[in-house]
């Protein structure tokens, strides 16, 4: 992978009302199932179509859930986190961390027609050519002096 990936991290309070099949999202993570290396946090792995979370629209796959009804999700076994969601009641307040990926430099392969995905050689070749022309002009100028 070329370039560096930075993240813009924001937090949000999301209130959901439980539907017939729960809150409408799946979770991964926990101290016994690290989803992100060196992070035992609880993450949203899937938003279920037409579920409570999808209808609300704010929760996204990949979001980290920090707390449920004010209860911290740090250092929990996966099943303990699941039980918290199962027993959270009808109206559930989630503290969520969104991570928006910000790209610095070219990352992976970009599709054709992506204006921000200019191959590096298309920048370097003109720069190199201009440098050579400038160097040649400078040398000619010095010879005339």
């Amino acid at each position: 992978m070329n370039g560096r990936v930075d993240y813009l991290v924001t937090e949000e309070e999301i209130n959901l009302t439980r539907g017939p099949s729960g809150l409408g999202f799946n979770i991964v993570g926990g101290t016994d199932q690290q989803y992100v290396s060196n992070d035992s946090g609880i993450y949203v792995s899937r938003i279920k179509e037409n579920g409570a979370a999808a209808l609300d629209g704010r929760l996204q796959e990949g979001d980290k859930i920090l707390s449920v009804n004010g209860q911290d999700l740090k250092n929990l076994l996966h099943q303990d986190a699941v039980d918290l969601f199962r027993n959270a009641g009808y109206a559930v307040s989630l503290r969520v961390q969104h991570r928006l990926q910000v790209q610095n430099g070219p990352i992976g392969h970009r599709g054709e027609g992506d204006p921000s995905g200019i191959p590096i050689f298309m920048v370097l070749v003109p720069v190199f050519a201009l440098t050579m022309v400038a160097a040649w002009a400078f040398m000619r100028y010095r010879q005339q002096l």
């Epitope: 999202f25 799946n26 979770i27 016994d32 792995s45 899937r46 279920k48 579920g51 699941v82």
Partner: nanobody, 125 residues
Framework: QVQLVESGGGLVQPGGSLRLSCAAS????????IGWFRQAPGKEREGVSC???????YYADSVKGRFTISRDNVKNTLYLQMNSLKPEDTALYYC????????????????????WGQGTQVTVS
């Protein structure tokens, strides 16, 4: 209304095969981590095989290499292909889904699941 209905059980000789089906209604199967469980008379219920919404699978050691879990998202049905059946596979087989967990191992090891079917009997004799 979330509903799971199992079928495909029966009486089979040792070494034989069966294919169990679990038809889901009221929800989209591939949105859930779901699995197969069994309970033999006088024994605790155990997780046999589970699959996450993203397709990761887990098998109990006792069935590895003999059983295969799969999902047909068009038919909204979960399957368990059981080959080389043994008398100790005799049990009532259920399918069950978790509304929250997407970790197939945790689902198979959990009693705290959210939707259960009624079960289908498998007898190997």
């Amino acid at each position: 209304q979330v509903q799971l209905v199992e079928s495909g059980g029966g009486l089979v000789q040792p070494g034989g095969s069966l294919r169990l089906s679990c038809a889901a209604s009221g929800f989209t199967l591939d949105d859930y981590a779901i699995g197969w469980f069994r309970q033999a008379p006088g024994k605790e219920r155990e997780g046999v095989s589970c699959i996450s919404s993203h397709g990761s699978t887990y098998y109990a050691d006792s069935v590895k290499g003999r059983f295969t879990i799969s999902r047909d998202n068009v038919k909204n049905t979960l399957y368990l292909q059981m080959n080389s059946l043994k008398p100790e596979d005799t049990a009532l087989y259920y399918c069950a889904a978790s509304y929250y967990s997407d970790y197939e191992v945790a689902v198979c090891r959990s009693d705290a699941l959210d939707a259960w079917g009624q079960g289908t009997q498998v007898t190997v004799s």
